[in-house]
């Protein structure tokens, strides 16, 4: 058993049929010694008396808010949550496996630049009685500070018969050094509580590996005289790190016909313009990637050819 | 060329070669799938490679003030990785396929280090740890880790030379 926060405790249980459970001793936070009784949740049934209560925690029915009273007055509360371990593996019932980039990916994180700011998100099908708390640091043995905000519900989607809820959180490294080569990864820890079930999820990454630039901005076409060719130009996204002579991007320009089956023409360039042939009903798209490190490409910025 | 005394390197040549190094480092080890390193014990396989850190003057302001600190750091790293790529970790079993980009990568690391430090000038180099894995699979693990950290190192070096070529070239 360990303390998650004041008056909230997590009991770690090996979860299998007829498991013996864990013996837990609760102590009433009071100077009083006599006439103390204990109840669980809303029930008025007295579970025991005395300053301490010893219980055997085996299942969710044994978890909940234990309250000690004296003469009708509440003295203190202890909320017990359960953390299940099945076959040596902690349960992951609350969050959905996003399976990208690999199985058992529950948290996904992205950064728009090297400033030390990043966003993480996760998915669940649970809509109520759900709380999250997020902590982060750079490195684990001698951790350096990363400040995370509160997790918020950022999207709701319908998937078949189920609703899916996306939560996200923004974090900022306290003393980021955008030009340095990271040697210690960022660690993100999410505590998830659904009713009386506790779970924790972690992710470890370098900012450089989660970089995904915003799409190029101000995408424009300029027809070239007496030619089917056009000059496409664009600019670095505002959110990208500066100076651009140092934090450089590379770009992919694509000409795509109306039909998805039509052949795509692609050009790669380090410049912020390119000359391409504009076909009727086609569109021109440009995306960006860090020039020197193969992290994710941005989403496409597109304009129609007409 | 970056002479230890303080004259300027051939920024444009360094830019071109460092960009080539980035391409080679990624072709030597693209991110195919996601290797599960957790199940491979890391004992005997950790390696303290040199990193370009915050105080090394490799940021745009530091380069403007005095690029020598940063160039020396890059040079140290290039020599370190060049030695690693020529060591038993990469020459031992399982042997690399003949068309592996590691040979080119090795040569390019040497080329860039020589551009930064011509013959007869000596910057201090970091001692390379003697890493001779007792198991062939540990070589695979070390190759993986070395190439992943080399990708990060050469990315910073390439940014430095790109910025230098754009803003510090005479």
């Amino acid at each position: 058993i360990w303390e998650l926060k004041k008056d909230v405790y997590v009991v770690e249980l090996d979860w299998y049929p007829d498991a013996p459970g864990e013996m837990v001793v609760l102590t009433c936070d009071t100077p009083e010694e006599d006439g103390i009784t204990w109840t669980l949740d809303q029930s008025s049934e007295v579970l025991g008396s005395g300053k301490t209560l010893t219980i055997q925690v085996k299942e969710f029915g044994d978890a909940g808010q234990y309250t000690c009273h004296k003469g009708g007055e509440v003295l203190s509360h202890s909320l017990l949550l359960l953390h299940k371990k099945e076959d040596g593996i902690w349960s992951t019932d609350i969050l959905k496996d996003q399976k990208e980039p690999k199985n058992k990916t529950f948290l996904r994180c992205e950064a728009k630049n090297y400033s030390g700011r990043f966003t993480c998100w996760w998915l669940t099908t649970i809509s109520t009685d759900l709380t999250f708390s997020v902590k982060s640091s750079r490195g684990s043995s001698d951790p350096q500070g990363v400040t995370c905000g509160a997790a918020t519900l950022s999207a709701e989607r319908v998937r078949g018969d189920n609703k899916e809820y996306e939560y996200s959180v923004e974090c900022q490294e306290d003393s980021a050094c955008p030009a340095a080569e990271e040697s210690l990864p960022i660690e993100v820890m999410v505590d998830a509580v659904h009713k009386l079930k506790y779970e924790n999820y972690t992710s470890s990454f370098f900012i450089r590996d989660i970089i995904k630039p915003d799409p190029p901005k101000n995408l424009q076409l300029k027809p070239l005289k007496n030619s089917r060719q056009v000059e496409v130009s664009w600019e670095y996204p505002d959110t990208w790190s500066t100076p651009h002579s140092y934090f450089s991007l590379t770009f992919c320009v694509q000409v795509q016909g109306k039909s998805k089956r039509e052949k795509k023409d692609r050009v790669f360039t380090d410049k912020t313009s390119a000359t391409v042939i504009c076909r009727k009903n086609a569109s021109i798209s440009v995306r960006a990637q860090d020039r020197y490190y193969s992290s994710s490409w941005s989403e496409w910025a597109s304009v129609p050819c007409s | 060329r970056a002479v230890p005394g303080g004259s300027s390197p051939a920024w444009t040549q360094c830019q071109q070669l460092s960009q080539k190094l980035c391409t080679l480092a990624w072709s030597a080890h693209p991110l195919v799938g996601h290797m599960d390193l957790r199940e491979e014990g890391d004992e005997e396989t950790t390696n303290d490679v040199p990193h370009i850190q915050c105080g090394d003057g490799c940021d745009p302001q530091g380069l403007r003030d005095n690029s020598q600190f940063c160039l020396q750091r890059i040079h140290q790293g290039l020599i370190f990785y060049e030695k690693l790529l020529g060591s038993d970790i990469f020459t031992g079993e399982p042997s690399l396929l003949p068309d592996s980009p590691v040979g080119q990568l090795h040569a390019s690391l040497l080329g860039l280090s020589q551009l930064l430090q011509p013959e007869g000038h000596h910057w201090e180099t970091q001692q390379i740890p003697s890493l001779s894995p007792s198991q062939p699979w540990q070589r695979l693990l070390l190759r993986f880790k070395i190439l992943r950290s080399l990708q990060a190192f050469v990315a910073v070096a390439a940014r430095v030379f790109a910025h230098g070529a754009a803003t510090l070239s005479p």
Partner: antibody, heavy 126, light 111 residues
């Protein structure tokens, strides 16, 4: 075609040594390793060690506690396996095999004992 | 050392029937979670062994009635339709850790 030709059968006294040769032809000797495997009468296979002439690396089965020495002569494309302090339980057929052990930079990797010698019977008897 | 345990020791199967040989390692013999360092060899009487399955790949020239599967510590060699020429002893071999180790062998015969 690839061939590994081993030296002939040997009868040895306990406590003595035996040196078995394995002459390779039909391929570039230094591009592959040579592995030694033995098989006691009616028993299974036992890996003794292997040598890679190109890297100079040799791997041994510690079970033989320094009794086995594997060498290669690049000039004659011949590999040797010497086993000392012989005992009766060393009576076995000793095989050499060409080993190919290659990988992309990291993985997957490929390990094959793809061509074998005919085997050399070593009998240890007083 | 990694101990390789093969089962069964011997197996008698009718012609055209399926034969399944198991090999269990005392430690994981996959690398990076996916790459297999487990190989299968066939040895006929009076002959040296012959490689039939390399990691997760059937050697060229080996009939496709042979198939290999498994990861981690548990591996299987299956002959989907046993032929007379498949009578032999089959050995698994791990080359993740030196010393490389063979299983004890499984003798396949015709019933």
């Amino acid at each position: 075609q690839v061939q590994l030709v081993q030296s002939g059968a040997e009868v040895k006294k306990p406590g003595s040594s035996v040196k078995v040769s394995c002459k390779a032809s039909g391929y570039t000797f230094t591009s592959y390793g040579i592995t030694w495997v033995r098989q006691a009468p009616g028993q299974g296979l036992e890996w003794m060690g292997e040598d890679y002439p190109r890297s100079g690396n040799t791997y041994y089965n510690e079970k033989f506690k320094g009794r086995v020495t594997i060498t290669a002569d690049k000039s004659t494309s011949t590999a040797y396996m010497e086993l000392s302090s012989l005992r009766s339980e060393d009576t076995a057929v000793y095989y050499c095999a060409r080993s190919e052990f290659i990988s992309t930079v990291v993985a997957p990797y490929y390990y094959a004992l793809d061509y074998w010698g005919q085997g050399t019977l070593v009998t240890v008897s007083s | 050392d990694i101990v390789m345990t093969q089962s069964p020791d011997s197996l008698a199967v009718s012609l055209g029937e399926r034969a399944t040989i198991n090999c269990k390692a005392s430690k994981k013999v996959t690398i990076f979670g996916s790459t297999s360092a487990l190989h299968w060899y066939q040895q006929k009487p009076g002959q040296p062994p012959k490689l039939i399955y390399n990691g997760a790949k059937l050697e060229s020239g080996v009939p496709d009635r042979f198939s290999g599967s498994g990861s981690g510590t548990d591996f299987t060699l299956t002959i989907s339709s046993l032929q007379a020429e498949d009578v032999a002893v089959y050995y698994c071999l791990q080359n993740k850790e030196v010393p490389y180790t063979f299983g004890g062998g499984t003798k396949v015969e015709i019933k």
